[in-house]
Amino acid sequence: SIPWNLERITPPRYRADEYQPPDGGSLVEVYLLDTSIQSDHREIEGRVMVTDFENVPEEDGTRFHRQASKCDSHGTHLAGVVSGRDAGVAKGASMRSLRVLNCQGKGTVSGTLIGLEFIRKSQLVQPVGPLVVLLPLAGGYSRVLNAACQRLARAGVVLVTAAGNFRDDACLYSPASAPEVITVGATNAQDQPVTLGTLGTNFGRCVDLFAPGEDIIGASSDCSTCFVSQSGTSQAAAHVAGIAAMMLSAEPELTLAELRQRLIHFSAKDVINEAWFPEDQRVLTPNLVAALPPSTHENLYFQ
Amino acid sequence: GAMGQEDEDGDYEELVLALRSEEDGLAEAPEHGTTATFHRCAKDPWRLPGTYVVVLKEETHLSQSERTARRLQAQAARRGYLTKILHVFHGLLPGFLVKMSGDLLELALKLPHVDYIEEDSSVFAQ
């Protein structure tokens, strides 16, 4: 049966046994800045092009054992959530991956900046249709990372990022705090904010909306047909990147402001239990869970 | 306003140095382009001292970025410091990535075209 997260973002009219918009997002290219990925996984094979971009720091620890499957874990799962054959949101979207996170999931602001610059240069050299950039990463507040995101957004690129898994104000982290970026928090099957041990999803005025981010089934890098469940605001951001790709494929001329407005408009409202958030953050945190547009856009979204 | 004349060392007479740590992460805009500021991650464990993004003013051309980077290297060498330019940015933001001692920040902040400098820091998969 349909995984809970895909059911949650699907308008009621399309809630059949299967989530199958056959061509969702086909006009859109989604860039993923993450770990390396297993591009021959059945879920994403032929859908993800691995660029030659790589800018990562060395792994920590003298006894670190580098295993390809572990190096690829985070990125492979997210690529699957965005465009996977069976468990993806925008099954028609094509993706390009850039490696900015090492085998331990760690990167640098400078490496991310160079990655964003690479995307901008690629866009200038070979202009294509709408671009979505997924940044499933977070660091401390960074003026320069936010500025680079702003410039890329002004060039017409849609940036989607994870709010962060620190159970903290997203405004203290980047790129989550960049106003031009669509910042996504994570909710679970009960529409509650995701708890990750003592930590959990970030919140506050820098979050634009929430999306499914707990027990998300997606491609596992353990084998080319394996699946695994992962949790986090990265998974939530991947859902919104997929939804954005579907919307932009249906309406390629949408501006960032219009897209953001549509995302908010079609979200489920006031379903999140705000008691989870600190009292002073409740009024600032949007009570929105992302969803695809309803049947009025049937011909556009499910062509 | 008009920029002051460069002396042989490449410093500007009228540039004011404001070395601020911006601990709260919420930077105020620099005053009328006269003050270059320093920023670093408010979370100490995520800081990567020794690598810095030197961000230049918006309309700076690539050739000026390269020249500014070379000037920093020359001035640093005169003071006995080794530096390495790791990347020159253009296309999104003008500037460059440099590996150098934190002792050189004061010098770097006085370079022409510099808007602000940010110490590199870690980002993590979420």
């Epitope: 620890g61 874990s73 331990q104 999931g105 760690k106 620190f166 990750l196 003592t198 930590l199 | 800081r47």
Partner: antibody, heavy 122, light 110 residues
């Protein structure tokens, strides 16, 4: 609810081996780093070892390096500590503890077991 | 020998405030996140503070943490008899590539 239960402690002679286990329940075990911490009678806490959530990185205190091995079986939700060449000074209550997150091992430990006692004596 | 130094004991009357210091170096407290733990007599330790000053849910705001340079401080206000316990600071040490605990401080409520 979130729970860690240690087992495998007991009395052992110096030079012998012992394997401690820690059964985790109530949370996604594979998403968290795990620590072993010990406390000698009447003394303070001493960190012993850490393993990352996916087992890719292991760290040890100098006092146990080369003698103790930390491992995990994510399919069984179990953490292990293989203790070889035991010494009298290894006598302690051994706690397993969950790291606050998978990646941010320096955040410390947020869930602790009740401990299992290891006595090394001839 | 612990690399983090705490006072052996502190005491105060009920309702008063106590502070516990934890002194380290740049390789631990100076550049890594500090946590504080409470160990009530005969029980396992419990997390009180992480990331210098954040409290897990369920920990009252009477407990607070701060950091300055290579030292960290735990504050307990409105002291209660139930706060009688041993308190430990802890952090990663980059030089040792390991976690380190403080020497521990016994809090007594007079």
């Amino acid at each position: 609810q979130v729970q860690l239960v240690e087992s495998g402690g007991g009395v052992v002679q110096p030079g012998r081996s012992l394997r401690l286990s820690c059964a985790a329940s109530g949370f996604t075990f594979s998403s968290f780093g795990m620590h072993w911490v010990r406390q000698a009678p009447g003394k303070g806490l001493e960190w012993v070892a850490l393993i990352w959530n996916d087992g890719s990185n292991k760290y040890y205190a100098d006092s146990v390096k080369g003698r103790f091995t930390i491992s995990r079986d994510n399919s069984k939700n179990t953490l292990y500590l293989q203790m070889n060449s035991l010494r009298a000074e290894d006598t302690a209550v051994y706690y397993c503890a969950r790291a606050i997150a998978a990646l941010y091992y320096y955040y410390g430990m947020d869930v602790w077991g009740h401990g299992t006692t290891v006595t090394v004596s001839s | 020998q612990s690399v983090l130094t705490q006072p052996p004991s502190v005491s105060a009357a009920p309702g008063q405030k106590v502070t516990i210091s934890c002194s380290g170096s740049s390789s631990n407290i100076g550049n890594n996140f500090v946590s504080w733990y409470q160990q009530l007599p005969g029980t396992a330790p419990k997390l009180l503070i992480y990331d210098y000053n954040k409290r897990p849910s369920g920990i009252p705001d009477r407990f607070s943490g701060s950091k300055s340079g290579t030292s960290a401080t735990l504050g307990i206000t409105g002291l209660q008899t139930g706060d009688e316990a041993d308190y430990y600071c802890g952090t990663w040490d980059s030089s040792l590539s390991g976690y380190v605990f403080g020497t521990g401080t016994r809090v007594t409520v007079l």
